[in-house]
């Protein structure tokens, strides 16, 4: 029997009946055995076929077999109801070998030319399976030349049998207070040859409850308890199961905070598995009763371990733990069934006694000493000498615990001194220097510190003066002895003030003329305003209308008098403003340098002389009455003049204050 080629030789070739293409002889039997490499099969097809036709191909035939199985018995030229000719069919071996047998009987009625066939080895696609057959691989099948391999979906691993996919279903830990777990792929059939372990691990104090839901279908056996696939539930106290079959197991109250669920499957079966819904419970905490004027949130039927509630107070009430305030309050239920914090109170907000108002007073409107939520108080300033700045002085105790004005301010109102009050009214005509009476010049300040000088009180803690008068003390402010509220220069009865800082105008140059001869002294304490101590007003924008040529201003001080000595009593003089050009011309001639009088100066005095300020008056205010507000304001600061005070044709020169309003305001607001 001829053998076909064997692997590893190339597996392809031609087969033909003896004598082909001539007619074949009688009583012939020829056998070919073809062998392909492992993982390959043989493909065979006929290019010519002409054999004697007989019933069931009993006479002449070609038989194709693979292993023990006959693939085909062929005869004739074309197929009939009972006989088969190959035609254009292709034949495939079942494994890697194919047997071909040719036989002819003792006679042929006519000549037959036999057959010609070609064969070749080809790869078997093991991944292709006939309908109804078990798939080659559980999940994915991969064909390759000479073989195949299986792989698995994510979450599975290939079993050592190289075909089954076992679920990677261990190590899952459930830590939520409730949840669901199920067999892999549920409700589709669970995987074979798998061992799954699930853990429920809750905080100590919780107890896990297991409920089997929807459906339960785990492979079982009628006689033996769960020999194939089974589900087991283990706690630190006991084991439940094994479970299998189609009946939903009953609820399991584990009385444990940790549960291990084990699910084991074998290599066969087609079952949908199981689903567990788990919940937990714990020892409940006492039901929280909201304090008066407060409420609990969230409201629950019961509160167990880890549950919490917060307390919120009604508007106007605040959380207090005793005397201590809390912004928020949340209590958490503990494993022993107690709350971790005691219940606070919701107490009515108390803004407390209102702060004292300097130079003012406070009145309880709602009731004597009532300082709780929505209580009203009224601040007012001491009449005559103080006026309230910014707000109306009405404050309400608001829910945040602060006294708040109608404008929403939480700071105290300010009692600002009333400026420009004087006991004196202007005389309207000029006469000689006179002694001041009490209350005439309550802004007058006496400055002692090396020399005698003057100044004017601004607000209740600033003094306006001339730069040249305090220049020597600019770095030693504490050396200035500042006195006010007295008429007599040497009197022991005065109000003492001390300097905190001296601010000299940056444009002033000492011993180089008197341009920008202006300075401010900040006092280290506020002075109490009364009829003898009152600040002077700063000029309004419209003030120039009261300071035209020939308008009368008043200068006051303890400077040199006609007798050549410092005045014992405060003196004053009413003098007219002098035309600026006239004044400039008066100081153009020697010994005065050109440009001595600048636009930052104003001049006042009589052409005939005799009425003037003098040494010792420096820094004092030249004041004017604002007839609209009926308040006195500072128009000039005593600065310089002729060597001989009150000289005819010469005038007193004063720093023009209106030019320095921004400078004054900036320093006072910054410091």
């Amino acid at each position: 029997t001829p053998l076909g080629p064997k692997w590893p030789e190339p597996v392809f070739g031609r087969l033909a009946s003896p004598g082909f293409p001539g007619e074949y002889a009688n009583d012939q039997e020829r056998r070919w055995t073809l062998t392909a490499p492992p993982g390959y099969r043989l493909r065979l097809y006929f290019t010519h076929f002409d054999l004697e036709l007989s019933h069931l191909c009993e006479y002449d035939f070609v038989k194709l077999s693979s292993g023990a199985k006959v693939l085909a018995t062929l005869c004739g030229q074309e197929s009939t109801d009972t006989e088969r000719a190959p035609g254009k069919d292709t034949f495939y071996s079942l494994g890697s070998s194919l047997d071909i047998t040719f036989r002819s009987d003792y006679s042929n009625e006519k000549p037959f030319t036999g057959f010609e066939a070609f064969y070749a080895a080809e790869d078997i696609d093991e991944c292709q399976v006939a309908p109804g057959e078990a798939p080659t691989c559980d999940h994915h099948c991969h064909n390759h030349l000479g073989g195949f391999y299986c792989s698995c979906r994510a979450g599975y691993v290939l079993h050592r049998n190289k075909r089954t996919c076992s679920a990677l279903c261990s190590g899952q830990v459930f830590t939520q207070r409730s949840g669901e777990l199920s067999s892999p792929e549920y409700p589709r059939p669970y995987p074979k040859l798998s061992s799954c372990t699930y853990s429920i691990s809750l905080e100590e104090g919780f107890s896990v409850i297991l409920d089997f839901v929807e459906s339960f279908d785990v492979e079982t056996h009628p006689e033996t308890l769960c020999p194939y696939d089974f589900l087991k539930i283990q706690t630190d106290r006991e084991e439940h199961g094994p479970f299998c079959g189609k009946t939903l197991p009953h609820r399991i109250e584990t009385k444990s905070n940790t549960v291990t669920i084990t699910f084991v499957t074998d290599e066969s079966g087609d079952h949908t598995g199981w689903k567990i819904h788990y919940t937990s419970t714990a020892q409940p905490c006492p039901y929280p009763m909201a304090p008066p004027n407060g409420h609990v949130s969230p409201v629950q039927a019961k509160y167990i371990l880890k549950d919490s509630f917060s307390i919120f107070c009604e508007t106007g009430y605040e959380l207090l733990q005793g005397h201590l305030p809390l912004k928020s309050f949340t209590a958490v239920c503990q494993k022993d069934g107690s709350w971790d914090r005691p219940m606070p109170a919701c107490s009515i907000v108390d803004c407390g006694p209102p702060d004292d108002l300097p130079s003012g007073r406070v009145e309880y409107i709602t009731g004597p000493g009532v300082t709780t939520y929505k209580a009203v108080i009224q601040y007012s300033c001491e009449e005559t000498f103080y006026t309230m700045k910014v707000n109306d002085g009405k404050y309400v105790c608001e829910a945040d615990g602060f006294w708040t004005s109608s404008k929403g301010e939480k700071s105290l109102p300010v009692c600002e001194p009333v400026c420009g009050l004087s006991a004196r009214t202007t005389g309207g005509r000029i006469y000689g220097g006179q002694k001041a009476k009490p209350g005439d010049f309550p802004w007058q300040v006496l400055i002692l510190g090396g020399t005698t000088a003057a100044g004017a009180l601004l607000y209740d803690n600033w003094v306006l003066t001339a730069a040249h008068a305090v220049y020597e003390q600019k770095h030693d402010a504490s050396a200035l002895d500042i006195r006010m509220g007295t008429l007599k220069r040497l009197s022991p009865h005065y109000t003492q003030a001390w300097s905190e800082a001296v601010f000299i105008h940056e444009g002033y140059t000492h011993d180089a003329g008197f341009d920008n001869d202006i300075a401010l002294i900040k006092l280290n304490n506020k002075v109490v305003i009364n009829s003898n101590i009152t600040p002077i007003c700063l000029p309004r924008k419209e003030a120039e209308s009261f300071m035209r040529t020939d308008d009368i201003g008043t200068a006051s001080g303890w400077g040199l008098t006609q007798r050549g000595f410092l005045a014992r009593n405060l003196m004053y003089v009413d003098i007219p403003i002098v035309d600026h050009q006239k004044c400039t011309a008066a100081y153009e001639k020697p010994p005065y340098p050109r440009g001595s009088v600048t636009a930052n100066m104003l001049c006042a005095g009589l052409e005939s002389g005799g009425k003037d300020s003098c040494r010792g008056d420096s820094g004092g205010a030249l004041v004017f009455l604002d007839s609209e507000t009926e308040r006195w304001f500072v128009g000039g600061i005593v600065s310089w003049g002729s060597m001989n005070c009150g000289e005819a044709g010469q005038y007193g020169v004063y720093t023009k204050v209106i030019n320095y309003i921004p400078w004054i305001e900036n320093i006072i607001s910054d410091f």
């Epitope: 305030p325 912004k327 928020s328 615990g401």
Partner: antibody, heavy 114, light 107 residues
Framework: DVQLQESGPGLVKPSQSLSLTCTVT?????????WNWIRQFPGNKLEWMGY???????SYNPYLKSRISITRDTSKNQFFLQLNSVTTEDTATYYC???????WGQGTTLTVSS | DIVMTQSQKFMSTSVGDRVSVTCKAS??????VAWYKQKPGQSPKALIY???YRHSGVPDRFTGSGSGTDFTLTISNVQSEDLAEYFC?????????FGAGTKLELK
């Protein structure tokens, strides 16, 4: 972790003012609670001086009200104690503490002496 | 002001003993009482608040009880590190007031 740290001069002359700072880390002083100043005299007697709350409201021991002020700087998470007109009787270790005293600073010792 | 009286300035104990430190308020303070432990050269350390609530990290051998005017701090199974001075505080009303302290020492 909540931490409080006091800082101050150590020595102050009688009649002067005392200023102490408490720096808080690990918790914002505006988030919640009262922030207290407490002092401990030689001999270990403890005295509560006052607090400033999360909202900035203050409460003082009535015995000190005329000369105490507690303020804060929320940007630096600090609160301050100012005690005016100190005398030798104010010599003590000064502590800052949160709420009912769940957290304390390590204390700063103050001596009032000329 | 509410006076907090710790009647015993000193208490002697042995390691392993159970000891109770008491504090009496001159007025009702509800449960607004805290307890502290202080060792020489250290700041006070919180133990108990609201009369019976243990502060976090405090060993459970420390127990607080009482309400109204009478309060007790109990230390069961005294350890050597418990030898210190103990103070009570009422925070029910202004001014907050402390007890004078009770020093726990070895017998």
């Amino acid at each position: 972790d909540v931490q409080l740290q006091e800082s101050g001069p150590g020595l102050v002359k009688p009649s002067q003012s005392l200023s102490l700072t408490c720096t808080v880390t690990g918790y914002s002083i505006t988030s919640d609670y009262a922030w207290n100043w407490i002092r401990q005299f030689p001999g270990n007697k403890l005295e509560w001086m006052g607090y400033i709350s999360y909202s900035g409201r203050t409460s003082y021991n009535p015995y000190l009200k005329s000369r105490i002020s507690i303020t804060r700087d929320t940007s630096k998470n600090q609160f301050f104690l100012q005690l005016n007109s100190v005398t030798t009787e104010d010599t003590a270790t000064y502590y800052c503490a949160r709420y009912w005293g769940d957290y304390w600073g390590q204390g700063t010792t103050l001596t009032v002496s000329s | 002001d509410i006076v907090m009286t710790q009647s015993q300035k000193f208490m002697s104990t042995s390691v392993g003993d159970r000891v109770s430190v008491t504090c009496k308020a001159s007025q009702n303070v509800g449960t607004n009482v805290a307890w502290y432990k202080q060792k020489p050269g250290q700041s006070p350390k919180a133990l108990i608040y609201s009369a019976s609530y243990r502060h976090s990290g405090v060993p459970d051998r420390f127990t607080g009880s009482g309400s109204g005017t009478d309060f007790t701090l109990t230390i069961s199974n005294v350890q050597s590190e418990d030898l210190a001075e103990y103070f009570c505080l009422q925070y029910n009303s202004n001014p907050l007031t402390f007890g004078a302290g009770t020093k726990l020492e070895l017998k």
